[in-house]
Amino acid sequence: WGFKNGIFHNSIWLEQAAGVYHREARAGRYKLTYAEAKAVCEFEGGRLATYKQLEAARKIGFHVCAAGWMAKGRVGYPIVKPGPNCGFGKTGIIDYGIRLNRSERWDAYCYNPHAKECGGVFTDPKRIFKSPGFPNEYDDNQVCYWHIRLKYGQRIHLSFLDFDLEHDPGCLADYVEIYDSYDDVHGFVGRYCGDELPEDIISTGNVMTLKFLSDASVTAGGFQIKYVTVDPASKSSQAKNTSTTGNKKFLPGRFSHL
């Protein structure tokens, strides 16, 4: 947890989801009239998000503690997790309703179905994560979080299908980080860059986080990372070995989340 731009953040909260993203004026928060909010969204090739679009984004982890204009002059903000300083302890869209005065100043919630999406919260039994734009090169200045949450008792088997990120000795420029937890604070497994395929990873519990970051310069081919569910009964999930065996890394049992 931590503060960013005056907003209480946990990395599981997505900065954009399902094509929806938050924008504010260059002077800071709550400076846009309805017409200006609309123009900001249009400038970036989008439009003001509808209430339904904002709610769909909220359902997959979009959480912003700042009221903004939506389509049809509505104002509100999406809350995933209730908190004392935001959302009056409620979850859902905190809805200020349709504003009669369109000159009021708020932020903006935009929708762009063509925005290059990355990250999200995933509960599927298997899935492939790709760097934005794959198989084309990824862009500069990308930050993506993929949060996997399976059923209690299940584990996650991660395998790298394609991997090509800018190489530097400390992986300080572009990298993928894996965490054996539901955030990017606990259970750090490793940071990866370059073009060598990392070994498979099997989680200790039912949650895992992948973080992809690219800096402002060189880009490369990107990656595809696959995960599948390992059920409690299956052979590989019984392994207690914390060292690498074959091409799999087994993690010591530390984290398990409902």
């Epitope: 924008r23 004026a25 260059r26 002077a27 800071g28 400076k31 846009l32 009239t33 017409a35 200006e36 609309k38 123009a39 900001v40 249009e42 400038f43 862009d139 500069d140 200045n141 402002a216």
Partner: antibody, heavy 120, light 112 residues
């Protein structure tokens, strides 16, 4: 689609004034500022200033203050720039361009330019 | 005023090559909110400038992903990954952090 249509070429005498127009279409005129830019061959581009049609506010490059007057007619979605006391230094092409000063997007769509010739 | 210096003045390239253009400011273009307002434009012969990149690295609507922008503070770069004939023209940067807005002198991209 967004369009900015500028008025035709102008031939004016030294010391006189000229009023250039920029008619816009395809977007909400009052939500974007209109910037004016001077482009002299071999000397690059110079920003003159902007006007925000929503409230008529302006922001100028000090170099052009007093020399350029920016106005708008919201009923016709048209912006105007009047240049005063013209000299041969002002003979060049002038562009209008749409911008979002309050978002910091800079300027996106440009007009085709108006050529001004100052000659006696 | 923030003086924008662009290099090189002329950039001869072969089609399919990567091109890189630099833009340097005499003062930081990061504002008090941590935002940096630096744009890149292409002006083809006889045409108006067209916006390619805004806020350092964001591609404008319809701009191909062969174009990418990077940098921070006072140093910025525009890269074109695989130059095509339609990319030829004069590229220039524009800073809109400080008033007056100021332009780079331009870089002419031409065929080698």
């Amino acid at each position: 689609q967004v369009q900015l249509q500028q008025s035709g070429p102008e031939l004016v005498k030294p010391g006189a004034s000229v009023k250039l127009s920029c008619k816009t279409s395809g977007y909400t005129f009052t939500s974007y500022d209109i910037n004016w830019v001077k482009q002299r061959p071999g000397q690059g581009l110079e920003w003159i200033g902007w006007i925000y049609p929503s409230d008529g506010s302006t922001k100028f490059n000090e170099k052009f203050k007093g020399m350029a007057t920016l106005t708008v007619d919201t009923s016709s979605s048209t912006a105007y720039m009047e240049l005063h006391s013209l000299t041969s230094e002002d003979s060049t092409v002038y562009f209008c361009a749409r911008g979002l000063w309050y978002y910091g997007g800079g300027v996106d769509y440009w007009g085709q330019g108006t050529s001004v010739t100052v000659s006696s | 005023d923030a003086v924008m210096t662009q290099t090189p003045l002329s950039l001869p390239v072969s089609l399919g090559d990567q091109a890189s253009i630099s833009c340097r400011s005499t003062q930081s273009l990061e504002d008090s909110n941590g935002n940096t307002y630096l744009n890149w434009y292409l002006q083809k012969p006889g045409q108006s400038p067209q916006l390619l990149i805004y806020r350092v690295s964001n591609r404008f609507s319809g701009v191909l992903d062969r174009f990418s922008g990077s940098g921070s503070g006072t140093d910025f770069t525009l890269k074109i990954s695989r130059v095509e004939a339609e990319d030829l023209g004069v590229y220039f940067c524009l800073q809109v952090t400080h008033v007056p807005y100021t332009f780079g002198g331009g870089t002419k991209l031409e065929i080698k």
